[in-house]
């Protein structure tokens, strides 16, 4: 004979557990129904009556099958440096992620708690490592034969144009200027070794120390002016 299907609430067999989407109520000592996502337990079960569920109120949610007495509050509205990538509904929390040009300096379980602007490399410096959703840009000095004339969080150092006749030689922050004969971008004759970064340590402010274990949030604090990170701008 097929086993009889038990309807909630029911007393479980000794040593057995309640079924999927059921929970064991310690007070009633019965297996009772959980509430579906978007709902919460309005009235807990008894020996004779099952759980009574109710919909979550506005700005609250439950994401899982549950028996919580109150729905969880959705997170606060996204800040100006964030975009809402998932709205608050009865079944899911709001998720805020950093808007373009920013990265997540302090993450939370879903989305981002604190966004920070991506570092911008100033002229003479290029992006050694691009910023990602969770990491900042790394700036390094342009090597001889390369240049960057922009203040940018995306631009790398690019090769100087190779001139038949050079009007103005290029440097770390300026491309070479050729005379009217057409320039090329091919390799310079005899240029067989690697480009070397210009050692410009003495020409720039010392880098602002940044802890390696946690993101810097000094731009949020009411502090006096400090020098920008080397090769970067604070804006």
């Amino acid at each position: 004979l097929p086993a009889q299907v038990a309807f909630t609430p029911y007393a479980p067999e000794p040593g057995s557990t309640c079924r999927l989407r059921e929970y064991y109520d310690q007070t009633a000592q019965m297996c009772c129904s959980k509430c579906s996502p978007g709902q919460h337990a309005k009235v807990f079960c008894t020996k004779t009556s099952d759980t009574v569920c109710d919909s979550c109120e506005d700005s609250t949610y439950t994401q899982l099958w549950n028996w919580v007495p109150e729905c969880l509050s959705c997170g606060s509205r996204c800040s100006s440096d964030q975009v809402e990538t998932q709205a608050c509904t009865r079944e899911q929390n709001r998720i805020c992620t950093c808007r373009p040009g920013w990265y997540c300096a302090l993450s939370k379980q879903e989305g981002c708690r604190l966004c920070a602007p991506l570092r911008k490399c100033r002229p003479g410096f290029g992006v050694a490592r691009p910023g990602t959703e969770t990491s900042d840009v790394v700036c390094k000095p342009c090597a001889p034969g390369t240049f960057s004339n922009t203040t940018s969080s995306t631009d790398i150092c690019r090769p100087h144009q190779i001139c038949n006749v050079v009007a103005i030689p290029g440097n770390a922050s300026m491309d070479a200027v050729c005379t009217s004969t057409s320039p090329t971008r091919s390799m310079a004759p005899g240029a067989v070794h690697l480009p070397q970064p210009v050692s410009t340590r003495s020409q720039h402010t010392q880098p602002t120390p940044e802890p390696s274990t946690a993101p810097s949030t000094s731009f949020l604090l009411p502090m006096g002016p400090s020098p920008p990170a080397e090769g970067s701008t604070g804006d």
Partner: antibody, heavy 118, light 107 residues
Framework: EVQLVQSGAEVKKPGATVKISCKVS????????LHWVQQAPGKGLEWMGW????????KYGQKFQSRVTITADTSTDTAYMELSSLRSEDTAVYYC???????????WGQGTLVTVSS | DIVMTQSPATLSVSPGERATLSCKAS??????VDWYQQKPGQSPRVLIY???IRYTGIPARFSGSGSGTEFTLTISILQSEDFAVYFC?????????FGQGTKLEIK
């Protein structure tokens, strides 16, 4: 011309720790990010992590994160990669690579063979 | 993780001919792709960075193209010294990942 010279081959027992050095010469180590890349025998390249010697900030690949430590000594222009809890599958050539403002790994060390065997 | 898939695994071409190597990313990586050459017993060396910029000292016969998810390395007139393994690499997001390599061999 920038040059990266790595320490010599190592033979280690399972469970041991290896520390490889990478000496940067020709230019200051702080002008670069230093990456470490693993290449197992007959296999492809696998990124392990990098260090920015300027501020000692590091970034690790998740596969290696719990076992690798990358450090740099700016006074000697040397970067180090330490890999702990070695197992046989860690037998590989390990490369350091310098990353300049072109955004690429433009100079590589000669590689260090690490053999893990009981 | 972003998966970089190179094809073919092995390419047999005669010297003087053109070789075209493909690299596909599992998601959009913009132009954040580099190409490296590795010869037996040697370290890799960069050929192309940012998908299409030829590195200092690299001969003009090497060119790179593509953006988004599809990238190509072309060697216009193969020289004997070009027979090697070629890897593509993406640096759009962490972890940085490499393709499995294409072995370019003499036909």
């Amino acid at each position: 011309e920038v040059q990266l010279v790595q320490s010599g081959a190592e033979v280690k027992k399972p469970g041991a720790t290896v520390k490889i050095s990478c000496k940067v010469s020709g230019y200051s180590i702080t002008d670069y990010l230093l990456h470490w890349v693993q290449q197992a025998p007959g296999k492809g390249l696998e990124w392990m992590g990098w260090i920015d010697p300027e501020d000692a900030k590091t970034k690790y690949g998740q596969k290696f994160q719990s076992r690798v430590t990358i450090t740099a000594d700016t006074s000697t222009d040397t970067a180090y990669m330490e890999l702990s809890s070695l197992r046989s599958e860690d037998t590989a050539v390990y490369y350091c690579a310098a990353n300049s403002a072109t955004g690429t790994m433009d100079a590589w060390g000669q590689g260090t063979l690490v053999t893990v065997s009981s | 993780d972003i998966v970089m898939t190179q094809s073919p695994a092995t390419l047999s071409v005669s010297p003087g001919e053109r070789a075209t190597l493909s690299c596909k990313a599992s998601q959009n990586v913009g132009s954040n792709v580099d190409w490296y050459q590795q010869k037996p017993g040697q370290s890799p060396r960069v050929l192309i960075y940012k998908a299409s910029i030829r590195y200092t000292g690299i001969p003009a016969r090497f060119s790179g193209s593509g953006s988004g998810t599809e990238f190509t390395l072309t060697i216009s007139i193969l020289q004997s010294e070009d027979f090697a393994v070629y890897f593509c690499m993406q640096s759009k997001s962490y972890p940085i990942t490499f393709g499995q390599g294409t072995k370019l061999e003499i036909k």
